[in-house]
């Protein structure tokens, strides 16, 4: 028996439903008695779902996996795992056991989108060419870890005096805060940029100072 | 026929670990779920874990997690569980059991383990 | 965890009765199992899938249910059955037991 899975990771995001697809071919006139299917974890072998001895033996993974039963005489050995967590992430084996054995590894890559970030100065108010501000751009929720990049109001990379911290929450969820320290010119505009690096998706932030007093740009 | 043959009878002391092996023979070892559980004496039966020889994938109980560890020797159709950290509550007939369909079918003989000091 | 309640604990009969002993899950389970054990040895599986019986299993011996709720009946009790009974759930992890009825003689 040879078994097929998808090479390229599985994308899912948090809270959404991911499908770990795999496959064999059965011979003419298989039986569903005959099938040993498990889904492990690669690492571990911690058992994840199996079907064996033409029984479904269910999920032994928090109560959120699930076979296409109807689809198992065909062939179609994939796993839908549900309500999708950061700590899913992983490889997982697929075992399809008939007379002989074969197996094959899934990775599942876990992401969820960053917020819109958030700006905020210090200080203020008052503010006055040659004062030095710190800008925090904060954005919530997210993963895996964001990369932020800084710009100034002509596109240029601002990269000096960057701090940028990024916490998990009890979901695994990173909590993104970068500050910026600089020193004001007559005005200007600086913008934060927070990007996932799995979904290629990325939020945005500015703040614009034109003296007094200071404006944040509508949301698009 | 299906016989399951387990390891003799153990007294170790607490904080010990013990290994105990149940021999398969009459049926093709790597195709079935072997399980092992538990009978304190006078009491009932408690599910420790399970494993597949032939992929090695395993589940535990969560009790028993952080002190068990089932494993299989495929050369000679043999099954181990070895339960680290013992106490006195871990005296008990240990059985090995062969899964049928979604039960346990066949039972090894059972091994009295005797946790003492 | 799926808890399973067998009851009665203890049941007195005498021999050639009919008796009928329960199971109750605490969630759905969609097939119960049913083992007998004799003092000092081994359980032996008795039905399967709720309703079938094992092997070399006497045909006195029955089971039904569905849900939380199941039975094993014994039509005609013989003297080898004065011994304790448990049932099974595989519908989840951790695959548990009852704590058992055990049968004696009245």
């Known amino acids: 028996v040879e078994v097929q899975v998808s090479e390229d990771p599985v994308v899912a995001l948090v809270d959404t439903d991911a499908t770990l697809r795999c496959s064999f071919s059965p011979e003419p006139g298989f039986s569903l008695a005959q099938l040993n299917l498990i889904w492990q974890l690669t690492d571990t072998k911690q058992l994840v779902h199996s079907f064996t001895e033409g029984r479904d033996q269910g999920s032994a993974y928090s109560n959120r996996t699930a076979l296409f039963p109807d689809l198992l005489v065909q062939g179609n050995a994939s796993l839908r795992l549900q309500r999708v967590r950061v700590t899913d992430e992983g490889s997982y084996t697929c075992f399809v056991s008939i007379q002989d054995f074969d197996s094959a590894a899934v990775s599942l890559q876990v992401a969820a989108p960053y917020s819109k970030p958030s700006m905020t100065l210090e200080p203020n108010k008052d503010l006055r060419p040659g004062n030095m501000v710190t800008i925090t751009c904060s954005s919530y929720q997210g993963y895996p870890e964001a990369e932020v990049f800084w710009k100034d109001g002509q596109g240029v990379p601002l990269t000096g005096n960057v701090t940028t911290s990024q916490m998990a929450n009890e979901r695994g969820l990173f909590d993104v805060h970068s500050v910026l320290r600089v020193v004001l010119g007559a005005n200007g505009t600086y913008s934060c940029l927070v990007r996932n690096p799995v979904l290629q998706q990325d939020a945005h932030g500015s703040v614009t100072i034109t003296g007094q007093p200071l404006t944040f740009p509508p949301e698009a | 026929q299906v016989q399951l043959v387990q390891s003799g009878a153990e007294v170790v002391k607490p904080g010990a670990s013990v290994k105990v092996s149940c021999k398969a023979s009459?049926?093709?070892?790597?195709?079935?779920?072997m399980h092992w559980v538990k009978q304190a004496p006078g009491q009932g039966l408690e599910w420790i874990g399970m494993?597949?020889?032939?992929?090695?994938?395993?589940n535990y109980n969560e009790r028993f997690k952080t002190r068990v560890t089932i494993t299989v020797d495929k050369s000679t159709s043999t099954a181990y569980m070895e339960l680290s950290s013992l106490r006195s509550e871990d005296t008990a007939v240990y059985y090995c059991a062969r899964s049928t369909a979604l039960a346990t079918g066949y039972w090894g003989q059972g091994t009295l383990l005797t946790v003492s000091s | 965890d799926i808890q399973l309640t067998q009851s009665p604990s203890f049941l007195s009969a005498s021999v050639g009765d009919r008796v009928t002993m329960t199971c109750s899950a605490s969630s759905s389970v969609s097939y119960m199992y049913w083992y007998q054990q004799k003092p000092g040895k081994s359980p032996k599986l008795l039905i399967y899938d709720t309703s079938n019986l094992a092997s070399g299993v006497p045909s006195r011996f029955s089971g039904s249910g569905s849900g939380t709720e199941y039975t094993l009946t014994i039509s005609s009790l013989q003297p080898e059955d004065f011994v304790t009974y448990y049932c099974q759930q595989w519908s989840s992890y951790p695959l548990t037991f009852g704590q058992g009825t055990k049968l004696e003689i009245k």
């Open positions: 494993i597949h020889p032939n992929s090695g994938a395993f």
């Open positions: 009459g049926y093709t070892f790597t195709n079935y779920w």
